[in-house]
Interface confidence: medium
């Protein structure tokens, strides 16, 4: 059973969110559950490090984009939010918090500013930003 939920502050249009935990989850209370992932959008602006710490305090991590199919709701996300992607100057690569390398097919990286962190924006785009700049952020928890 699916419910068409219009989350005006987060998404550009209607998104399908499951009604019952038996189809998805479990997730922390008031988090969005979608295709075996739990998401929460935090409105308070923090720098990347503070955002990471906030997610960790809730047994989650900053958003990791790993599948366009499983995370298709991210196509519709409004605005810019910190995700768990950082640039490693020593080897030049973009890495997720867990150390895995960004696959180029998942995100289009756009050099908006000089920096070593990235903001997620709609349609699978990542915008380079200074890690100390305050921004809203997305936490994610895998359920499987």
């Amino acid at each position: 059973i699916w419910s068409a939920v219009f989350l005006n502050s987060l998404f550009n249009q209607e998104v399908q969110i499951p009604l019952t935990e038996s189809y998805c989850g479990p997730c922390p209370k008031n988090w969005i559950c979608y295709k075996n992932n739990c998401y929460q959008f935090f409105d308070e602006s923090k720098n990347w490090y503070e955002s990471q710490a906030s997610c960790m305090s809730q047994n989650a991590s900053l958003l990791k984009v790993y599948s366009k199919e499983d995370q298709d709701l991210l196509k519709l996300v409004k605005s810019y939010h910190w995700m768990g992607l950082v640039h490693i100057p020593t080897n030049g690569s973009w890495q997720w918090e867990d150390g895995s390398i960004l696959s180029p097919n998942l995100l289009t990286i756009i050099e908006m500013q000089k920096g070593d962190c990235a903001l997620y924006a709609s349609s699978f785009k990542g915008y380079i930003e200074n890690c100390s700049t305050p921004n809203t952020y997305i936490c994610m928890q895998r359920t499987v």
Partner: antibody
Framework: QVQLVQSGAEVKKPGASVKVSCKAS????????MNWVRQAPGQGLEWMGR????????HYNQKFQGRVTMTVDKSTSTAYMELSSLRSEDTAVYYC??????????WGQGTLVTVSS | DIQLTQSPSSLSASVGDRVTITCRAS??????LAWYQQKPGKSPKVLVY???TLADGVPSRFSGSGSGTDYTLTISSLQPEDFATYYC?????????FGGGTKVEIK
């Protein structure tokens, strides 16, 4: 195994358009960007642009903006590249190439497009 | 746009020689560089990506190195099948330009 099979050679007149196809197999078509690269006779490689088969988002090399159109047919796992207003300088071998880990890991066999009056 | 300058544009070498090809970028490309080999009438084949990671099935005599704006492809001991044209390509910001190529010929 991954395969990219392109359409056959074409001869076109200046001002005409050409549409080259690239049929993909052996992998999940929607999970990897498809790129188009051309190579004029005896010359180097030139990136024309890419398309994301997942949502058809395109990114074209500014040099070809307005003349090139990249599309996909997800039902047949086929990518297309159409180049319009052809001129003699467009005579080249056109390749489709699958995006890998920051490289083009698989290439089509190439399609020779000859523009001649 | 980032420009890639390859040198030399051509070189003559013998089987067993150590061959070095360089690729200089007009700006920092942060190791987002690939190397390809192309033989006449054939499609290019990737050898190295992320500046130094060897692609699957590529012999260990090929290696990539460099950082920032300067990158190198090295063939430690040239084999008969290595005579070809080599191209570098960056993936830092579009357009993803290629170098002009280096033709490796038999001396």
């Amino acid at each position: 195994q991954v395969q990219l099979v392109q359409s056959g050679a074409e001869v076109k007149k200046p001002g005409a358009s050409v549409k080259v196809s690239c049929k993909a197999s052996g992998y999940t078509f929607t999970s990897y960007w498809m790129n188009w690269v051309r190579q004029a006779p005896g010359q180097g490689l030139e990136w024309m642009g890419r398309i994301d088969p997942y949502d058809s988002e395109t990114h074209y090399n500014q040099k070809f903006q307005g003349r090139v159109t990249m599309t996909v047919d997800k039902s047949t796992s086929t990518a297309y590249m159409e180049l319009s207003s052809l001129r003699s300088e467009d005579t080249a071998v056109y390749y489709c190439a699958k995006m890998g880990d920051y490289s083009f890991d698989y290439w089509g066999q190439g399609t020779l497009v000859t523009v001649s009056s | 746009d980032i420009q890639l300058t390859q040198s030399p544009s051509s070189l003559s070498a013998s089987v067993g020689d150590r061959v070095t090809i360089t690729c200089r970028a007009s700006g920092n490309i942060h190791n987002y560089l690939a190397w390809y080999q192309q033989k006449p009438g054939k499609s290019p084949k990737v050898l190295v990506y992320n500046a130094k990671t060897l692609a699957d099935g590529v012999p260990s005599r090929f290696s990539g190195s460099g950082s920032g704006t300067d990158y190198t492809l090295t063939i430690s001991s040239l084999q008969p099948e290595d005579f070809a044209t080599y191209y570098c390509q960056h993936f830092w910001s579009t357009p993803w330009t290629f170098g002009g190529g280096t033709k490796v010929e038999i001396k």
